[in-house]
């Protein structure tokens, strides 16, 4: 009897997760009758994986058929394995007793460890734009991969980038693992149709990595240019003075007319035009009728653009001095002020 | 703890059959098999036949190939021997027994049923 | 077929003396490195209790007393010290093939 080794051949396994496992066993010998049993760990605290003699273990299946004469072959197979079924395997041979079988031989143990896809990059960026010149921080999560070893790349439009920093949680051991990457983007002008990506390698991609991707649309405020000018008269006593707005992004803005400092008219833009860089140019004018201004006009165009604090471009009309007669030439000059 | 469980006594006219039954506890019934072995009154044992309730293998003794059938129903656990066309010499105490090495021995015994044929 | 042949038919010994009874096969029940005898003990309105298998490994809780030998065709189940609770019938069973029992031998107090 003391002759019976258990022989456990394979010190590890690994195994991708959904996939099954097969952990293989074999006794030297059919002596002591009893029965075969897989625990997961050692010790008091060890996990009852199979009972040959008796339970349910429906994700068990034993390799061979038990029931056959001569059988020493224990192996099992372990169905859909998750990363939380990483640990040590030990088969161990029970001997008969009365009333309970008693535990008579162990084998070296077989670890498995379970290779687990990380889930796909999330990439986010900040709660609020920012507008060029400013850095703004994403951050990159995935989760639920083993082994640890991963590894973690930026890109902006294909670019490397190269100032971020990356944390695999936890430290130690566990079953699964998180990784979490957080970069710093200078954006520009141009970033508009910029794409942020964060690209994750792992053994389980055979090569093919994950990527989460931010537009930078989604981050980027563009404040637009304002500028005044005034057209030929286009009738007697009427000024046309177009405000041009342009390269603004998003697209959300509100334009204000004020006569001197009164609102005259406001108006949303809507039929605006698009940039090759993603900006958008939106034009507005407004028809003056000189002959009813005894005074100079001061013509303001005031442009509030995705709820930020309003800009505004000035441009002053110079009324002439001699009396107004119907029909009557109305000369105007203009100057133009920028106001913030 | 293993425990097997038989029916009771029969009492059988010659020409009649017999279905004994073993309700089986304590294990994992389909593991191991099952063997059925008589006892004539003041007689020795004698081996009728086997039954893997896994996959229903039978290996029957060729004296009662012809009328035994052993079967078992795996929801309860329970295996049935039956024995057609009785004699009077089929008197005996039927005993089930489970083979717990499956080295086609007989580690834990049933208690036994008496079938008498008298007519 | 392999037969199984008991001797004697039955046997008185003295109590605290060795007791031998011996079981002969009609061919080599040896197979895979196994001699596959059993050994059996029945007392009066009980079912047969497995002592022995595979020749000579005693079963759970088996007494020390009982030892069982042999290979190939020939085997014996020795008591070394007859106790009065080992009154009983004893059978010899194989199973190199479908199993047999041999005949039994009955065992009694001299």
């Known amino acids: 009897e003391e002759g019976l080794q258990v022989i456990q051949p394979d010190k590890s396994v690994s195994v991708a997760a959904g996939e099954s496992a097969i952990l293989h066993c074999t006794a030297t010998s059919l002596i002591p009758v009893g029965p075969i049993q897989w625990f997961r760990g050692a010790g008091p605290g060890r996990e009852l994986i199979y009972n040959q003699k008796e339970g349910h273990f429906p994700r068990v299946t034993t390799v061979s058929d038990l029931t056959k004469r001569n059988n020493m072959d224990f192996s099992i197979r372990i169905g859909n394995i998750t990363p939380a079924d990483a640990g040590t395997y030990y088969c161990v041979k029970f001997r008969k007793g009365s009333p309970d079988d008693v535990e008579f031989k162990s084998g070296a143990g077989t670890e498995l460890s379970v290779r687990a896809k990380p889930s796909a990059p999330v990439v986010s960026g900040p709660a609020a734009r920012a507008t060029p010149q400013h850095t703004v921080s994403f951050t990159c999560e995935s989760h639920g991969f083993s082994p640890r070893d991963i590894t973690l790349k930026w890109f902006k439009n294909g670019n490397e980038l190269s100032d971020f920093q990356t944390n695999v949680d936890p430290v130690g051991e566990s079953v699964s693992y998180s990784i979490h990457s957080t970069a710093k983007v200078v954006l520009t002008r141009e970033d508009v149709h910029s794409q942020v990506i964060c690209e994750v390698a792992h053994v389980t991609l055979q090569g093919d990595p994950l990527r989460g991707t931010a537009n930078l649309s989604e981050t980027i405020r563009v404040p637009p240019t304002l500028e005044v000018t005034q057209q030929p008269v286009r009738a007697e006593n009427q000024v046309n003075v177009t405000c041009q707005v342009r390269k603004f992004y998003p697209q959300r803005l509100q334009l204000t007319w004020l006569e001197n400092g009164n609102v005259s008219r406001t108006e949303t833009a809507s039929t605006v035009t698009e940039n090759k860089d993603g900006t958008y140019n939106w034009m507005s004018w407004l028809l003056v009728n000189v002959s009813a201004h005894r005074d100079d006009v001061k013509l303001t165009c005031q442009v509030e653009h995705d709820g930020q604090p309003a800009v505004s471009k000035s441009h002053d009309l110079k009324v002439s001095a001699h009396p107004k007669e119907q029909g009557s030439n109305t000369a105007a000059e203009n100057t133009g002020s920028n106001e913030r | 703890q293993v425990q097997l469980v038989q029916s009771g006594a029969e009492v059988k006219k010659p020409g009649a059959s017999v279905k004994v039954s073993c309700k089986a506890s304590?294990?994992?019934?389909?593991?191991?098999?099952i063997n059925w072995v008589r006892q004539a009154p003041g007689q020795g044992l004698e081996w009728i036949a086997m039954i893997d309730p896994s996959d229903s293998e039978t290996h029957y003794n060729q004296i009662f190939k012809d009328r035994a059938t052993l079967t078992t129903d795996t929801s309860t656990s329970t295996a049935y021997m039956e024995l057609r066309s009785l004699r009077s010499d089929d008197t005996a105490v039927y005993y089930c027994?489970?083979?717990?090495?499956?080295?086609?021995?007989?580690?834990?015994w049933g208690r036994g049923t008496l079938v008498t044929v008298s007519s | 077929d392999i037969v199984l042949t008991q001797s004697p038919d039955s046997l008185a010994v003295s109590l605290g003396e060795r007791a031998t009874i011996n079981c002969r096969a009609s061919?080599?029940?040896?197979?895979?490195?196994?001699?596959?005898i059993f050994w059996y003990q029945q007392k009066p309105g009980q079912p047969p209790k497995l002592l022995i298998y595979?020749?000579?490994n005693r079963d759970s809780g088996v007494p020390d007393r009982f030892s069982g030998s042999g290979s190939g065709t020939d085997f014996t189940l020795t008591i070394s010290s007859l106790q009065a609770e080992d009154v009983a019938v004893y059978y010899c069973q194989h199973s190199r093939e479908l199993p047999t029992f041999g005949q039994g031998t009955k065992l009694e107090i001299k």
């Open positions: 595979l020749a000579s």
């Open positions: 304590g294990y994992t019934f389909t593991n191991y098999w």
């Open positions: 027994a489970m083979d717990y090495g499956s080295l086609y021995a007989m580690d834990y």
């Open positions: 061919q080599s029940v040896r197979s895979s490195g196994y001699n596959w």
